[in-house]
């Protein structure tokens, strides 16, 4: 039977009255333009809503914006536009919300053309009050908070100046000119690239990479001939132009740019690109674009130094035109990533890895689904997930895949079941085990969100017609109940819930359209009375993650350890609560060769788990140098996979080889680096 129509469905009784008492409507007293929402802080209940309306006149654009504040998760809003002197706020900069629970907010205002600088409104009390500050520059980017200290802000100006504030935007100082890109690193460090001659675009590949660790008092040039740079986990990456031609290569530093190593990755030409898909403190997923406008490339995974890379996935979809990739970190289960590959026939297929890129497979066909017409075999096919690429192609997919770290194992996504992604109307599928198995959850496209750490899933149909119904499930999407939240249907634009999936409130956003006007409206529904009691010990069950063969002693071992979780039983209708913490019990596994990758100069022959020394270290792909200078490189041929915690078992040892004579690099050696002070 279809999802939600099962006789055994554990229905929530009398839910209509319970939800009706907890449904709060707010009509925004302005014309429908655009609306943006921001949560200020975690568990504070404070939401800021900025509505903007543009009227393009002949000579200029007339704009109007309004600012609203809620402190009860969106049940009630107060118009606080007067706190910002009724100023028009620039939506392209959004609302810059401070890190953690700093309560800081920066709004960037639109100012008239002739002014000396821009204007910002600053709040450090969760938007209760704002201070107007006129800037000595016109901002080009949103204000960026230092992750370590929310009083420290940086911004780029339209004149390419790098500006820093040490007192939360009260005073600003230009610390450098001719800056292209700036990023906060750790410990209040700022990394930025500068151009010497014409402009950022003209000097691409001839930029310098600079660092300041004292907010602009002193500087150090840590790289030259830079094309671009990026930060991921504890790694600093720079793509650097080669001496002889127009190709460039990735260099990596793990000490904030003091020393660099050339990454063992293919070099790329002018039309190609590198992209850091994901990074943590252990390793990096790097996409290297294929030559030509193919729309695909190769994923490589790094070792713990970010230097040695293993080929992970071929023909990885990543369009050059729109810059779209479907690469998704499934945050509800360790080691799981989903992405798309481009087949020879130009169709798109979904692949999943459960071991951080070690092996990729197709997604298992959902039990309750039939293969669509893309399938060559009616009974054998896979689930293919619609993500960023499908959204960019307007394939009737309103949302990307969704997973939350505190809703263990749950993944929700639009998909089609066949040999490839289909252009037919997608359905919504759910996995409760991190992507190993899937079930059709809802027919047709929907918006969806996870509440109460997975205790409730809420969905709304994606339709061009006005809607007045939402659906909710208390058993991880097996059974659904519908609630009519208003008599008058609205044109639905989205579901909004507090980031982190701990809340029990959901806001339904949309607009009403009458003969003359259309207005924004929100309905906030609190599900607290649906989940009447707090969950107890009996409501949870033990679940072994990554379990595929319970008979096997090593069952569940991924990256050297297995984890048992306490998970809410599907039949339990209770509150995990805002303070819910995922309970997990890790246990270490014995090492096997699967827990090691081949070190530089070694490779794995196909269908062999042993690493064999490469006969010669020649070819661009293996140019390699440690810490920017020739150095005695010792290796036993194997390196533990980053993040792998296995112990005992197989412990491969190889004799030490001296590879220094084969080592080259064209990057800055430490003696070429220079420092200067302001």
């Amino acid at each position: 039977s279809a999802p939600g129509e099962d006789e055994e469905c554990g229905r929530v009784r009398d839910f209509v009255a319970k939800l009706a008492n907890n449904t709060h409507q707010h009509v925004f007293d302005d014309l429908r333009g655009s609306v943006s929402l921001s949560w200020v802080g975690d568990s504070t209940g404070v939401i800021l809503v900025l509505t903007t309306f543009h009227v393009p006149l002949v000579i200029m654009t007339f704009g109007q914006s309004k600012l609203y504040r809620s402190e009860d998760y969106g049940k009630n809003f107060k118009d606080i536009t007067d706190l910002i002197n009724n100023t028009f706020i620039r939506t392209e900069f959004g609302m810059a919300i401070g890190p953690e629970n700093s309560g800081k907010v920066v709004l960037t205002a639109e100012v008239s053309g002739g002014s000396r600088g821009g204007r910002i409104f600053r709040s450090s009390d969760f938007a209760k009050n704002f201070v107007q500050t006129d800037l000595p520059f016109h901002p080009l980017t949103q204000m960026m908070y230092s992750p370590q200290n929310s009083d420290y802000l940086l911004a780029l100006s339209t004149e390419n100046g790098l500006w820093v504030s040490k007192n939360f935007g009260g005073k600003w100082e230009e610390i450098h000119k001719a800056v292209c890109l700036a990023k906060w690193g750790s410990d209040n460090t700022i990394f930025f690239t500068t151009y010497a001659n014409g402009s950022c675009k003209a000097d691409l590949g001839a930029l310098e990479l600079w660092r300041t660790s004292d907010l602009g008092k002193s500087f150090k040039t840590i790289g030259v001939k830079i094309y671009s740079f990026g930060l991921g986990g504890r790694f600093l990456f720079a793509s650097v132009m080669a001496d002889k031609d127009t190709t460039r290569r990735i260099h990596v530093s793990t000490d904030q740019g003091d020393t660099w190593s050339m990454a063992q990755l293919p070099s790329v030409g002018q039309e190609q690109f590198y992209s850091i898909l994901a990074a943590n403190d252990d390793m990096v997923f790097m996409h290297v674009d294929e030559p030509g406008d193919t729309g695909f490339g190769t994923i490589f995974t790094s070792d713990d130094r970010g230097i040695v890379y293993s080929k992970s996935l071929d023909r990885h979809l990543y369009t050059t035109t729109g810059g779209e990739t479907d690469f998704t970190n499934v945050t509800s289960l360790r080691g799981v990533y989903i992405t798309s590959v481009l087949s020879e026939d130009n169709s798109i297929q979904t692949m999943i890895t459960f071991d951080q890129g070690g092996r990729w497979t197709h997604l298992r066909k959902p039990e309750n689904s039939e293969c669509d017409a893309t399938a060559k075999n009616k009974n054998e096919c896979s689930l293919h997930i619609h993500a960023s690429y499908s959204i960019s192609q307007k394939l009737n997919v309103p949302m990307a895949p969704l997973s939350e770290p505190n809703a263990v194992g749950i993944v929700i996504a639009h998909g089609s079941v066949g040999d490839a992604i289909s252009v037919m109307v997608p359905d919504v599928y759910i996995s409760d085990d991190g992507g190993y198995s899937w079930t059709k959850m809802l027919e047709g496209p929907h918006y969806y969100t996870i509440l109460d750490s997975g205790g409730i899933i809420v969905a709304a149909e994606h339709s061009s017609r006005p809607i007045n119904v939402i659906k909710f499930s208390t058993d991880e999407g097996q059974c659904w109940q519908t609630y009519t939240f208003t008599r008058d249907p609205i044109y639905f634009t989205g579901l909004a819930s507090e980031p982190g999936a701990r809340s029990m409130n959901i806001s339904i956003w949309g607009f009403t359209e009458s003969f003359l006007t259309s207005q924004w409206v929100s309905y906030t529904i609190d599900f607290k009375d649906i989940l009447e009691r707090n969950c107890e010990e009996k409501d949870y069950t033990i679940w072994l993650a990554h379990s595929t063969d319970p008979e096997d002693y090593e069952d569940g071992c991924i990256l050297g350890y297995k984890e048992q979780f306490l998970r809410l039983r599907k039949s339990s209708v209770c509150q995990n609560g805002r303070d819910y913490v995922v309970t997990k019990q890790p246990s270490i596994c014995l090492c096997s060769l699967e827990d090691f990758l081949c070190d530089f100069g070694y490779y794995r022959p196909e269908n062999d788990s042993k690493c064999v020394e490469q006969p010669e270290l020649k070819g661009h792909d293996l140019e390699f140098c440690l810490y920017g200078r020739e150095e005695h490189l010792t290796t036993n041929g194997y390196r533990k996979i980053p993040g792998d915690k296995c112990q005992g078992g197989v412990n491969p040892v190889r004799e030490v080889k001296d590879l220094k004579k084969k080592c080259t690099s064209n990057f800055l050696s430490p003696e070429k680096q220079n420092s200067k002070s302001n």
Partner: antibody, heavy 129, light 107 residues
């Protein structure tokens, strides 16, 4: 030459089912998808769904989901369309049409649509009590 | 689903004249569009595919243009056998959808 020959007219009572056949000849049967399109009296064309003759897998328009079943027999190069729980609104001419393009979403190279290039002569289905 | 809107519903043209038929999609269909001709009591016949390519055996007086949401079928000089109903159809997103048709009749 390439042709699609459909079964003869049918008269059915409401609630009954009808099964229309479409025999392909003059080309490799498994090399092209087959769509079914219907046309109510005096109305326009309405697409019902598509079948992949290679494995017999199907995709249906949501409107017909649960009521329509498309199958094929490769030994006779024939596709079938069965519509159940018939109502008077199902009175129409039903066409099979060769649909070369399939339904896989294109990657970055644009998908190219070749159109339904060969049609059956149509089967009239009348639903009346 | 993508809604295809054809205009005009009826077009009265004299033989030898030019006929221009319009088809609009509710969202972009790229060039995944076909035009069909249907005469009374007959099955539709493919005229144009890929928005602008003539199907095999279709006379040169039929031409298709457009991409995205706006498409045109032009019959440069109407012959007596061209009086029929013309349908556009998109295959960008499932379900495939047809326009309501334009009837080209003798003026």
């Amino acid at each position: 030459q390439v042709q699609l020959v459909q079964s003869g007219a049918e008269v059915k009572k409401p609630g009954a089912s009808v099964k229309v056949s479409c025999k392909a000849s003059g080309y490799t049967f498994t090399s092209r998808y087959m769509s079914w399109v219907r046309q109510a009296p005096g109305q326009g064309l309405e697409w019902m769904g598509i079948i992949n003759p290679v494995g017999g897998s199907t995709s249906y328009a949501q409107k017909f989901q649960g009521r329509v079943t498309m199958t094929r027999d490769t030994s006779t190069s024939t596709v079938y369309m069965e519509l159940s729980s018939l109502r008077s609104e199902d009175t129409a001419v039903y066409y099979c049409a060769r649909d070369p393009s399939g339904i896989a979403a294109a990657g970055p190279a644009s998908r190219y649509y070749y159109g339904m290039d060969v049609w059956g002569q149509g089967t009239t289905v009348t639903v009346s009590s | 689903e993508i809604v295809m809107t054809q205009s005009p519903a009826t077009l009265s043209v004299s033989p030898g004249e030019r006929a221009t038929l319009s088809c609009r999609a509710s969202q972009s269909v790229s060039s995944n569009l076909a035009w069909y001709q249907q005469k009374p009591g007959q099955a539709p016949r493919l005229l144009i595919y890929g928005a602008s390519t003539r199907a095999t055996g279709i006379p040169a007086r039929f031409s298709g243009s457009g991409s995205g949401t706006e498409f045109t079928l032009t019959i440069s000089s109407l012959q007596s056998e061209d009086f029929a109903v013309y349908y556009c159809q998109q295959a960008r997103l499932g379900p495939w959808t047809f326009g309501g048709g334009t009837k080209v009749e003798i003026k």
